[in-house]
Amino acid sequence: SSELKTACKKHELYVSFQDLGWQDWIIAPKGYAANYCDGECSFPLNAHMNATNHAIVQTLVHLMNPEYVPKPCCAPTKLNAISVLYFDDNSNVILKKYRNMVVRACGCH
Amino acid sequence: SSELKTACKKHELYVSFQDLGWQDWIIAPKGYAANYCDGECSFPLNAHMNATNHAIVQTLVHLMNPEYVPKPCCAPTKLNAISVLYFDDNSNVILKKYRNMVVRACGCH
């Protein structure tokens, strides 16, 4: 139940490009530590939850109208890029930096 | 069911400071259009969903491991400030700009 669910936080997740079916065009790396955010954004939102002012307001509105307004959601607040070596459509080898691939921190939004 | 739920988008929400119990310290405004984000971040994430690269990856991992990794969540991508006139602890009247109070746009994160 949501009462027992842990508070919003970063969880470790390694993503294999083979599992995603991308192994034929991504040369390197074979995968990466993507991580993800999960957990409850429940009242009261404490400092660890990196909550925006809007999230604080939304939490209060949710308490008064849970059927209509959801709790804020647990989402990335800091994301990092990774460099990927891949084949383009013309079979050229390209090194490209992909933004917003790795979750560094999570918060209530 | 999640299949029937609309895609991630901005929903209108007017918040009354009286409803929040803040009427004794907030002089003006009486309330504001806070809005909120809600809806599904389901595969495939289209351009309207303002999805990060991480959200695209997480959507695929969720489909393969729904028990372990949640769908990305629908969260604000653009927030605006509002100016608030209020009494401080010493009963002084203060005009202050509060950041991240109004949802302007939503996306999958």
């Epitope: 027992l4 669910k5 599992d19 995603l20 079916g21 999960d38 | 969720h62 393969m64 729904p66 372990y68």
Partner: antibody
């Protein structure tokens, strides 16, 4: 060794409920999702739903229209599947099955026969 | 919901035969398919996961191939203990759906 042991066979009246248990041993219960699958006599396999005992996250097959509830008790490493408003078509063998991340249902319980008859 | 269609629904074969069972998904599920074997009165047993990966303890005569919407389970040389019913399962969101099954009988 890793195993799932289910409760014994049940005979139930139409309209009543049944609760089947599945006791896990030989692994960390909260590290793996537990699924429930049923099989009517002479028929194929039908997925009912799952629970992740780590966070009590559940998901159900909508074919059961809110009649199924899956729970887990970490203290006894036991998962439960309760099916309410039973009808004769619910007569089936009910299986619990573990599914690791990135894998399929690798360990299954022995099955529990539930017979619904007036 | 994704539909999984297995064919044939039944087949007769002899010991030593090469047997092929196919499974088609109504949507692209990439490599997210499993195969199970079930004998009468027993629980299903995992044979193949992620379309091609052999589960622990499964003999090498079993192999899986395919990706996207079309998948195949092959038994290279049928053994007496292989007479059973085989199910495919798509693992792509929920509900997790099974194929209708293929019964492999002795000719």
């Amino acid at each position: 060794q890793v195993q799932l042991v289910q409760s014994g066979a049940e005979v139930k009246k139409p309209g009543s409920s049944v609760k089947v248990s599945c006791k896990a041993s030989g692994y960390t219960f909260t590290s793996y999702a537990m699924h429930w699958v049923r099989q009517a006599p002479g028929q194929g396999l039908e997925w009912m739903g799952y629970i992740n005992p780590y966070n009590d996250g559940t998901k159900y097959n909508e074919n059961f229209k809110g009649r199924v509830t899956i729970t887990a008790d970490e203290s006894t490493s036991t998962a439960y599947m309760e099916l309410s408003s039973l009808r004769s078509e619910d007569t089936a063998v009910y299986y619990c099955a573990r599914r690791p991340f990135g894998n399929a249902m690798d360990i299954w319980g022995q099955g529990t026969l539930v017979t619904v008859s007036s | 919901d994704i539909q999984m269609t297995q064919s044939p629904s039944s087949l007769s074969a002899s010991v030593g035969d090469r047997v092929t069972i196919t499974c088609r998904s109504s949507e692209n599920i990439y490599r997210n398919l499993a195969w199970y074997q079930q004998k009468p009165g027993k629980a299903p047993k995992l044979l193949i996961y992620a379309a091609t990966n052999l589960a622990d303890g499964v003999p090498s005569r079993f192999s899986g191939s395919g990706s996207g919407t079309d998948f195949t389970l092959t038994i290279s040389s049928l053994q007496p203990e292989d007479f059973a019913t085989y199910y495919c399962q798509g693992i792509w969101g929920t509900p997790l759906t099974f194929g209708g099954g293929t019964k492999v009988e002795i000719k």
